[in-house]
Interface confidence: medium
């Protein structure tokens, strides 16, 4: 028998430095948890502890801290080539900056193979891209050799921005010839490595003939056997267990996300590549764990340029960008306006000529806003100031919803209106009426949402059954401010960019701005 | 010069507690590794465990539940503690400078001249 | 754990002969960095050990050019070209390849 170690990460957005446990700016330092410092020691330790080793990442490393804000993917390949990663999956955010952001600072710098057996490169870019990213990639490992093959979501497209000469194909249609390949180069021990989330995970472990094991990412799915250390609940035990349909036992097995754990699986191999065990969990990378002072030097030095960007002015605003909890939490603000606006923006993608766009609506909890703006100030606005309006380092989503979904979250809005409460929906894309005479669960009067499968934008009465594309919050998307209806009815739940970095790069490509307050929330009757 | 000096207690008293301190000079704790190995009278080595520069420690599987090995780097001190003594765990107890660099080498370079523990009622 | 076996258990020299001395492990030492993690130890009467070779066969400083280590996965020989009296003791291999390193059971190296 032949024993391997995966290490694994995915789903990091950008976390290099430590972080609070529910992965946000780390304040009190004994209490931290994750980044890149720690995570080397772990990994270090575990390296010397045992002999076949591989560090895996399943993609999603991009976006969402001002990390990547500002080194745009050049902090990813050098923190990844010093931790030594093996492998790396390429996950829908590494596609935010277009095909050139992924190709100059990570694909060319990094020094592991990147890997994608379902993006097929087309046109102009065949050439350019070629040989920078992989479909599989043989790994010797002591006295053996494994085959990770990759594959990223086709939802790409309509995720983040991969142009139009990337294809993005069906993963197991794509995985398939490319693991026949490996068994042909007699390659027996096969790991998929990818970034498409843990149903289909699932599918690829139970589908594709000759994969052994299946490291995943992009759902932030927390699996573990046993008593879990901090707050994420698990969905399953750690590994998955998958009967494939040739009847082998696949384990399946991702690490939650922001680098908060290292995934651990061991896998016993017997001599002709057949999986005979596998066991381990995920390591909470807690303060117990100390950082490595060299990581954490660079670490250090790195963060001098943030601090700088920070105060630098990225546009100016001509109005007062009222985000006075007085304002956002009781009717229409500009700030709510603002920010929706550049949550559509930021969505925009123009996938087929059927639709202007994929998406056109945005709801957010005015309690989520959490200051204002004064243009007094040579109307500068700068990233310290908008993570000020937004200091929870939260990402603006992508949900499927239906109608109805949305009719019961606009009830949700108002019913106890009045009270100063964070539940009241700032929106975009959206006209909403509210008669607050009625009883609470009866106040939406009128609610029209603004149409995608149209040439020219209008808004249309909201159809209950009609599912609905979404822009919103994560807090939202995962029942926060008491939208339980969101969290339980969502049909489909993809995490987006990080929320300051949508605002700012809207205000830094529009230069000025001028938000009004345009009728987009009214109530009737004369009840307000 | 790299030096490593124990200091035990000489004699212990089965199901007592077991406390070794190695001092070091010439090399810092927060670089280097220091590992721990023992020595049965006229028999062979054993491994015990591993206190990393980074404080990070790898322990045999065996001894797991009762070994724990901590450090103070600033009196370049590292200290051994083994619970629940037996006769068996009679041996000379030696550590070693253990040479690292990041996860390629390591190995025990320079050992202490160890210190002779007798477990005995 | 890996068994280290050394062999022979004891070896008889005179000064100035060749002495091999030879270790197998139960399963290859070869980590997936590359590294190959078997090193030789001498340890003489009352002394603790000394490190001779790490790695298969890089030596230690000061340690001198008659000493020399090879071999691979799981099978490796030490070599003294020729024998001084400062050289006899017990010789241990040992592994660092993976949690827990072990040693071998050591080769008596002594005058005939």
């Known amino acids: 028998a032949w024993e391997l170690t995966i290490l694994h990460t995915n789903d990091v957005h950008s976390r290099l430095e430590q972080t609070s446990e529910d992965s946000s700016k780390c304040v009190n330092a004994s209490r931290c948890m994750g980044g890149v410092a720690r995570l080397f020691t772990k990994v270090q330790q575990i390296r010397r502890a045992e002999p076949n080793v591989l560090l895996l990442d399943a993609g999603d490393q991009y976006q969402g801290t001002i990390w990547f804000t500002v080194y745009k993917g050049a902090e990813v390949a050098h923190f990844m080539n010093a931790l030594r990663y093996d492998a790396m999956a390429l996950g829908n955010h590494e596609f935010d900056n277009g095909v050139e952001g992924l190709i100059e600072p990570l694909l060319k710098e990094a020094k592991f193979p990147i890997l994608s057996a379902n993006i097929k490169a087309k046109g102009p870019l065949a050439s350019q891209i070629s040989g920078l990213y992989l479909p599989y990639k043989v790994l010797p490992v002591g006295d053996e050799v494994v085959g990770i093959v990759g594959y990223t979501s086709k939802e790409t497209p309509f995720l983040s921005n991969p142009g139009t000469n990337l294809v993005f194909e069906d993963e197991i249609t794509a995985l398939q010839p490319e693991v026949d390949k490996l068994k042909t180069l007699n390659v027996n021990k096969i790991i998929a490595l990818g970034h498409s989330g843990f149903e289909m995970d699932k599918l690829i472990a139970q589908k594709v003939r000759g994969v052994d094991v299946v490291v995943g990412g992009h759902s932030n799915t927390f699996l573990y056997t046993g008593n879990p250390p901090s707050k994420e609940v698990p969905a399953g035990k750690y590994p998955f267990i998958v009967t494939s349909d040739d009847g082998r036992k696949v384990p399946v097995v991702q690490a939650y996300a922001f680098g908060k754990y290292l995934g651990y699986l061991k896998i016993e191999f017997d001599e002709r590549g057949n999986v005979i065990s596998s066991h381990g969990n995920p390591i909470l990378l807690n303060s117990s764990i100390p950082e490595d002072p060299s990581i954490k030097a660079d670490i250090n030095k790195w963060r001098i340029k943030l601090d700088n960007y920070s105060t630098q002015e990225l546009g100016k605003t001509i109005v007062y960008l009222d985000g006075s909890s007085q304002s956002c939490r009781f009717r229409e603000c500009n700030m709510g306006n603002l920010i929706c606006d550049a949550m559509i923006n930021n969505n925009l993608r123009h996938t087929d000529e059927m639709f202007w766009n994929h998406v056109s609506m945005c709801i957010l909890n005015g309690g989520g806003i959490r200051s204002p703006i004064d243009e007094r100030n040579n109307g500068t606005i700068t990233w310290e100031n908008l993570a000020a309006v937004l200091p929870f380092g939260g990402t603006f989503d992508l949900v499927q919803l239906k109608g109805s979904t949305l009719k019961k979250a606009f009830e949700h809005s108002v019913h106890r209106y009045g009270q100063s409460t964070g539940e009241f929906l700032q929106v975009g894309g959206i006209h909403v009426v509210y008669d607050l005479s009625r009883k609470p669960g009866d106040r939406v009067v009128k609610l029209d949402v603004l149409c995608t499968k149209c040439r020219v934008p209008s808004y249309d009465p909201l159809k209950m059954d009609e599912v609905y594309k979404v822009i919103l919050p994560n807090f939202l998307a995962n029942g926060g401010d008491g939208f339980q209806m969101i969290k339980d009815e969502l049909l489909r739940h993809d995490s987006g960019d990080q929320d300051i970095n949508v605002v700012s790069t809207y205000i830094s490509k529009m230069k000025v701005i001028y938000p009004a307050v345009e009728g987009r929330i009214k109530f009737s009757t004369g009840s307000h | 010069d790299v030096q490593l000096v124990e200091s035990g207690p000489g004699l212990v008293a089965p199901s007592q507690s077991l406390s070794i301190t190695c001092t070091v000079s010439?090399?810092?704790?927060?670089?280097?590794?220091v590992s721990w190995v023992r020595q049965p009278p006229g028999k062979g080595l054993e491994w015990l465990g591993v206190?990393?520069?980074?404080?990070?420690?790898n322990y045999h599987s065996a001894l797991i539940s009762r070994l724990s090995i901590s450090k103070d780097n600033s009196k370049s001190q590292v200290f051994l503690k083994l619970n629940s003594l037996q006769t068996d765990d009679t041996a000379t107890y030696y550590c070693?400078?253990?040479?690292?660099?990041?996860?390629?080498?390591?190995?025990?370079?320079?050992w202490g001249a160890g210190t002779t523990v007798t477990v005995s009622s | 754990d890996i068994v280290m076996t050394q062999a022979p258990l004891s070896l008889p020299v005179s000064l100035g002969d060749q002495a091999s001395i030879s270790c197998r492990s139960s399963?290859?030492?070869?980590?997936?960095?590359?590294?190959?993690?078997l090193h030789w130890y001498l340890q003489k009467p009352g002394q603790s050990p000394k490190l001779l070779i790490y790695?298969?066969?890089n030596r230690f400083s000061g340690v001198p050019d008659r000493f020399s280590g090879s071999g691979s996965g799981t099978d490796f020989t030490l070599k003294i070209s020729r024998v001084e009296a400062e050289d006899l003791g017990v010789y241990f291999c040992?592994?660092?390849?993976?949690?827990?390193?072990?040693f071998g059971g050591g080769t008596k190296l002594e005058l005939k």
């Open positions: 070693a400078k253990t040479n690292i660099f990041y996860d390629y080498d390591w190995y025990l370079d320079v």
């Open positions: 010439g090399f810092s704790l927060t670089s280097y590794g």
């Open positions: 206190i990393w520069g980074d404080g990070s420690t």
């Open positions: 399963q290859s030492l070869v980590h997936s960095n590359g590294n190959t993690y």
């Open positions: 790695k298969v066969s």
């Open positions: 040992s592994h660092s390849t993976h949690v827990p390193w072990t």
